[in-house]
């Protein structure tokens, strides 16, 4: 007894096509691209039916159902728009990912299409959703403002400025990503094994402000070349935060220097440093203070400190800043803060130095502030961030 002629399901085809199907004859069903075999709502990899001796097929005909990529993944600090139609997630549907404007950006164009493999796919073939990366280095601060010799900062001037509080100590740091803080190794060395006891505050101008964004450290990474109590070479550390902070006008990372940034940090070029450290009056600043200071000649700085503190070395991993006449400097309590420069090409601020050490007499003539030269540590920073 022959089996009934099989009729291909919509969006499917049958092979082989025969005039008659008798005992042990078989046919397979294939779906058009963008459709998948379903039987009893269960996805099938393949389908073959066999004609039985009673003249019936051993399996009912499956259906060819349009591929559904499902709802796209949520995009932290962004959103997704359905382009093809409201909530349409089937084959060839298009969605558009966008980041929250001003404070986040994405590297791709954010357009994804539902492809035949059931994945939302970008034009570059990426299956993972895009990432909204924090914008860095935007500030309301302009160079030319007349710490020691400093002025109070205004909201949005230094949104990367971070206050690090221990039980009895205070230092600073700079946000360089939404979950990474750059600081001086000496400022956090004692906390390296007890990171959780470090209190991290951001989004503030007043040191004692009750309105701050709290962050907690997950781990502290001290540069392996730093030796505590034996000079300040490699005085650099990274703090990984337990959670990402939300970027806004008062909390934003500072950029890391581009390779070309070295040309913006030559002698006499002006940078800006902010902090809550000691002021001219010898008291910790209540309000975040900043000072615009020029980079000092490295040889001059080295000579000054060789005379002042024999045995203390100003290495190639350091840069000096300050006026020969004195009066403008960072001081105790500013440690770990960022010495920042404006990149004229991108119009973004980048961190060129980290407040490290200097003369006991902050702001004294011919006694410069010494900063960790960040550009020397870009590979180290990138390695830590990518691996942890």
């Amino acid at each position: 007894r022959p089996c009934p002629d099989p009729t291909a399901p919509p969006n499917g085809s049958i092979s082989p096509v025969q005039a008659i199907y008798v005992l042990k004859d078989r046919f397979s069903v294939f779906c058009k691209t963008g459709f998948e075999l379903l039987q009893g709502s269960v996805p099938l990899k393949s389908f073959t039916a066999v004609c039985q001796k009673d003249g019936s097929w051993d399996r009912p005909m499956p259906e060819c159902s349009i591929i559904d990529c499902g709802p796209p993944d949520d995009l932290p600090n962004g959103h997704v728009d359905y382009i093809t139609g409201p909530e349409v997630t089937t084959y060839k549907a298009v969605i558009q990912y966008s980041c929250e404007e001003t404070f986040y950006t994405m590297s791709s164009n954010g357009k994804y299409v539902c492809e035949a493999d059931g994945f939302w796919t970008s034009s570059k073939g990426e299956k993972l959703p895009p990432v909204c990366e924090p914008v860095c280095g935007l500030s309301t601060h302009t160079i030319g403002g007349r710490i020691v010799g400093g002025q109070p900062a205004k909201p949005g001037d230094f949104p990367w400025q971070v206050l690090l509080l221990g039980q009895t100590t205070a230092a600073a740091g700079a946000l360089i990503h939404d979950n990474w803080v750059l600081t001086a190794a000496h400022a956090v060395y004692e906390k390296r094994m007890a990171a959780s006891s470090l209190n991290i505050r951001m989004g503030i101008l007043k040191r004692l402000s009750p309105h701050y964004t709290q962050a907690w450290p997950e781990e502290i990474f001290i540069h392996e070349g730093y030796t505590h109590g034996a000079g300040f070479d490699n005085d650099i550390a990274l703090i990984k935060l337990k959670n990402k902070v939300t970027i806004n006008g008062s909390i934003m990372p500072v950029c890391l220097p581009r390779k070309e940034a070295a040309s913006l940090m030559r002698t006499d070029f002006t940078g800006t440093v902010a902090g809550w450290g000691l002021t001219q009056k010898g008291l910790l600043a209540r309000n975040l203070m900043f000072v615009d200071i020029p980079i000092a000649d490295h040889q001059k700085c080295t000579a000054v400190y060789e005379k002042l503190y024999p045995g203390v070395r100003v290495s190639a991993n350091m840069l000096c800043a300050g006026l020969e006449t004195g009066g403008k400097d960072s001081c105790r309590g500013d440690a770990g803060g960022a010495l920042v420069f404006l990149d004229n090409e991108t119009q973004r601020w980048f961190v060129g130095g980290i407040v490290s050490w200097g003369s006991i007499n902050c702001g004294a003539a011919d006694q410069y502030g010494v900063y960790t030269k960040v550009i020397n540590y870009i590979p180290w920073i990138e390695n830590i961030i990518s691996n942890f």
């Epitope: 709502s41 996805p43 559904d68």
Partner: antibody
Framework: QVQLQESGPGLVKPSETLSLTCTVS??????????WGWIRQPPGKGLEWIGS???????YYNPSLKSRVTISVDTSKNQFSLKLSSVTAADTAVYYC??????????????WGQGTTVTVSS | QSVLTQPPSVSVSPGQTASITCSGH??????AYWYQQKPGQSPVLVIY???KRPSGIPERFSGFNSGNTATLTISGTQATDEADYYC?????????FGAGTKVTVLG
């Protein structure tokens, strides 16, 4: 983000009917056209699929349990339920409710409840 | 209804590759799914339709299915991968699970 929560008595007497409810939060049970399932795990043993229900009410059951199982859906309460009759000690298990990965497909289960322990004992 | 057979246990050193097999009659003709279950927790889908990874599952988890055997491979195994792993398929509209494999990460 869709979350599932099982609820029901933790102790059932032999020969009685076990009744569990799964409450869906963070999304409507009827909006995504998903399948919703029940899976159980006896103590120290593996997983066993009990059955699945489509948002519209169509059901599929494990043949080994089919005569004792009823799964229903109540879209107004955003819940679906399991009833297992004539229980014995062999029905003692952690019972999980879960949601299918893709709409309109009985595919993998990608969202699970935390599970509820049911003990059958007199 | 098919039976899925898994080895009861697999041991692996950190950083090494763990392979868990799941055998069943003509399993390669059907889709295989894999779940990870840690003690006291609900199962988590790690592989669906033989080879696909849900979002959030690390790339070190991969799947393959051919002939009568599906395989879950964990490359560069980490201590956090220690768990029970279950394979699953759909056979004639019925969901079928393997008995599970306990993966132990040594050290």
């Amino acid at each position: 983000q869709v979350q599932l929560q099982e609820s029901g008595p933790g102790l059932v007497k032999p020969s009685e009917t076990l009744s569990l409810t799964c409450t869906v939060s963070g999304g409507s049970i009827s909006s995504g056209e998903y399948f919703w399932g029940w899976i159980r795990q006896p103590p120290g043993k593996g997983l066993e699929w009990i059955g699945s229900i489509y948002y519209s009410g169509s059901t599929y059951y494990n043949p080994s349990l089919k005569s004792r199982v009823t799964i229903s859906v109540d879209t107004s309460k955003n819940q679906f339920s399991l009833k297992l009759s004539s229980v014995t000690a062999a029905d003692t298990a952690v019972y999980y409710c879960a949601r299918s990965l893709k709409a309109a497909r009985r595919d993998a289960f990608d969202i699970w409840g935390q599970g509820t322990t049911v003990t059958v004992s007199s | 209804q098919s039976v899925l057979t898994q080895p009861p246990s697999v041991s692996v050193s950190p950083g090494q590759t763990a392979s868990i097999t799941c055998s069943g009659h003509k399993l390669g003709d059907k889709y295989a799914y894999w779940y990870q279950q840690k003690p006291g927790q609900s199962p988590v889908l790690v592989i669906y339709q033989d080879t696909k990874r849900p979002s959030g599952i690390p790339e070190r988890f991969s799947g393959f299915n051919s002939g009568n055997t599906a395989t879950l491979t964990i490359s560069g195994t980490q201590a956090t991968d220690e768990a029970d792993y279950y394979c699953q398929t759909w056979d004639s509209s019925t969901g079928v699970f393997g008995a599970g494999t306990k993966v132990t990460v040594l050290g």
